[in-house]
């Protein structure tokens, strides 16, 4: 089964600013990526960004910058201020739709003991959700 990995990092310069990186390990052509927080997309989660390889990128506050890193991975920077800013135990989820294969979603949150600015290399996410 294809895997989705999710990596959450708190920025050292802005302690309430987060970077989420997600990647897809599988076959097919990625047709859509949806990033949400507070739970899986469509199951209580709130959409932060939608990335389409041809139609472009849409993002919603507190998302500041969503972009493609490679053909199969994305990153999203979240603003660190305001009532809607994330906290340390917020769950972030990424859903990859891959044509004509399927769609897969995984979730992750900030590691409990993580130091700002430090992060482990991406590994398959602990939560892998196949819709």
């Amino acid at each position: 089964t294809p895997e989705v990995w999710v990596q959450v990092r708190m920025e050292a310069t802005e302690l309430s600013s987060f970077t989420i990186r997600c990647g897809f390990l599988g076959s097919g052509s990625i047709s859509l990526v949806t990033v949400s927080w507070g739970g899986p997309n469509g199951a209580g989660g709130t959409t932060l960004a939608v990335l389409h390889p041809e139609r472009g990128i849409r993002q919603w506050a507190p998302a500041r910058q969503a972009r493609w890193e490679t053909q199969s991975s994305i990153s999203l920077i979240l603003e660190g201020s305001g009532a809607s800013s994330p906290c340390a135990n917020t769950t972030f989820c990424c859903k990859f739709a891959s044509f004509p294969e399927g769609s897969w979603e995984a979730c992750g949150s900030l590691p409990p003991s993580s130091d700002p600015g430090l992060s482990a290399p991406p590994t398959p996410a602990p939560i892998l959700r196949a819709d």
Epitope: F99, P100, W104, D131
Partner: antibody
Framework: EVQLQQSGPVLVKPGASVKMSCKAS????????INWVKQSHGKSLEWIGL????????NYNQKFKDKATLTVDKSSTTAYMEFNTLTSEDSSVYYC??????WGQGTTLTVSS | DIQMTQSPSSLSASLGERVSLTCRAS??????LNWLQQEPDGTIKRLIY???SLDSGVPKRFSGSRSGSDYSLTISSLESEDFVDYYC?????????FGGGTKLEIK
């Protein structure tokens, strides 16, 4: 691993409709779209369309959009393809596939009066 | 629709021989190409995805490569069970399209 079991061979008359099934084992589609593919006798393969079992969303090959209807029953983890207004040109083997990796054994459709 | 021209349509070869099958795409498809194997009873199995990635459980004698718009499936040393049909499949754009197939026969 997703295993797909397709319904048996069918013989129908021209002008009729037929509905074939594709049952996923283990009570899950495991995230995979269900693709449907046509193989005419001794010929190559043609993609008919796909359905996303999670939400019922479909994507059809324009050539088949008025001929095929794809549906899914999540409770029984079964995908269906209905073919309407059948002619002899529709006599073929039809495959369902989970993505492009897991393939059913095929359903033979014969249209004859 | 993207046309996939597969050659040869049939190929006679001997056990242990190295063979290559080719598909040419009518438009740019990047690496969005799979190779499928079909047995006489109709059973279909994916061998290669994304041009060159081997599916799990597929013998290492199978490999995939690309040169421009030409995509190749190579079998390094033919075994008896390899004498079946092969198809390429592009999925760069909808609808996905298949090559016409290659029938691999024993000499």
């Amino acid at each position: 691993e997703v295993q797909l079991q397709q319904s048996g061979p069918v013989l129908v008359k021209p002008g009729a409709s037929v509905k074939m099934s594709c049952k996923a084992s283990g009570n899950t589609f495991n995230g995979y779209y269900i693709n449907w593919v046509k193989q005419s006798h001794g010929k190559s393969l043609e993609w008919i369309g796909l359905i996303d079992p999670s939400n019922g969303g479909t994507n059809y090959n324009q050539k088949f959009k008025d001929k095929a209807t794809l549906t899914v029953d999540k409770s029984s983890t079964t995908a269906y393809m209905e073919f309407n207004t059948l002619t002899s040109e529709d006599s073929s083997v039809y495959y369902c596939a989970g993505g492009t990796v897991y393939w059913g054994q095929g359903t033979t459709l014969t249209v004859s009066s | 629709d993207i046309q996939m021209t597969q050659s040869p349509s049939s190929l006679s070869a001997s056990l242990g021989e190295r063979v290559s099958l080719t598909c040419r795409a009518s438009q740019d498809i990047g690496n969005n190409l799979n190779w499928l194997q079909q047995e006489p009873d109709g059973t279909i199995k994916r061998l290669i995805y994304a041009t060159s990635s081997l599916d799990s459980g597929v013998p290492k004698r199978f490999s995939g490569s690309r040169s421009g718009s030409d995509y190749s499936l190579t079998i390094s040393s033919l075994e008896s069970e390899d004498f079946v049909d092969y198809y390429c499949l592009q999925y760069a754009s909808s609808p996905p399209t298949f090559g016409g197939g290659t029938k691999l026969e024993i000499k």
